[in-house]
Interface confidence: medium
Amino acid sequence: MMTGTIETTGNISAEKGGSIILQCHLSSTTAQVTQVNWEQQDQLLAICNADLGWHISPSFKDRVAPGPGLGLTLQSLTVNDTGEYFCIYHTYPDGTYTGRIFLEVLESSVAEHGARFQIP
């Protein structure tokens, strides 16, 4: 039975040209995390594999940096970066846990961080 929960940075906003950290945290399970995938809609951004470390998809190498931790840093943000981001935790023996983050990239300086929330 899957008992874990994923806590994410939730709905967040950032300024165009700036950077943002996407963070997820898996709790309430003793399952071993073997890999974390970061995806934007259907595009793979990055992989953090327990044995092999980080792989950033070639098309995002210039603007995506690994970390901190299992998180992902997006740099040089554009309005086109607005949308849903998913952290997908592959675990053993539980299986797969998915967290969702919505990022809005704003033209002005009114960007504020949203509240944290949990996805069961």
């Epitope: 073997t34 594999n49 070639p58």
Partner: nanobody
């Protein structure tokens, strides 16, 4: 039917080299993450290297970086692991796996493995 057949293992002295092969059938390597894993007696199976044929990206575990090289010959549908400067701690059964990074908690297809023994 998907089949993976490893070969090339054997007994080698410390500091020596071996080249492992993984002949794949039933699918094409193109578009797949292929991985080499190893399992030493009494230890968990660990991934040592993986390669993305479409992008050519290769990942290595810290313990083998600079000594092992993963490659492929798409015309032969075969993956390779060149192992140099071998150490006694490299002794293990080596396996190749298809879709190595798709979900590292569950692997659909495994070969039978090839034993590598590093000893003087």
């Amino acid at each position: 039917e998907v089949q993976l057949v490893e070969s090339g293992g054997g007994l080698v002295q410390p500091g020596g080299s071996l080249r492992l092969s993984c002949a794949a059938s039933g699918f094409t390597l193109s578009g797949n993450w292929m991985g080499w894993f190893r399992q030493a007696p009494g230890k968990e199976r660990e991934m040592v290297a993986a390669i993305d044929w479409s992008g050519g990206s290769a990942l290595y575990a810290d313990s083998v970086k600079g000594r092992f090289t993963i490659s492929a010959d798409n015309s032969k549908n075969t993956a390779y692991l060149q192992m140099n400067s071998l150490k006694p701690e490299d002794t293990a059964v080596y396996y190749c796996a298809k879709d190595a990074l798709s979900n590292s908690a569950r692997f659909d297809h495994w070969g039978q493995g090839t034993l590598v023994t590093v000893s003087s």
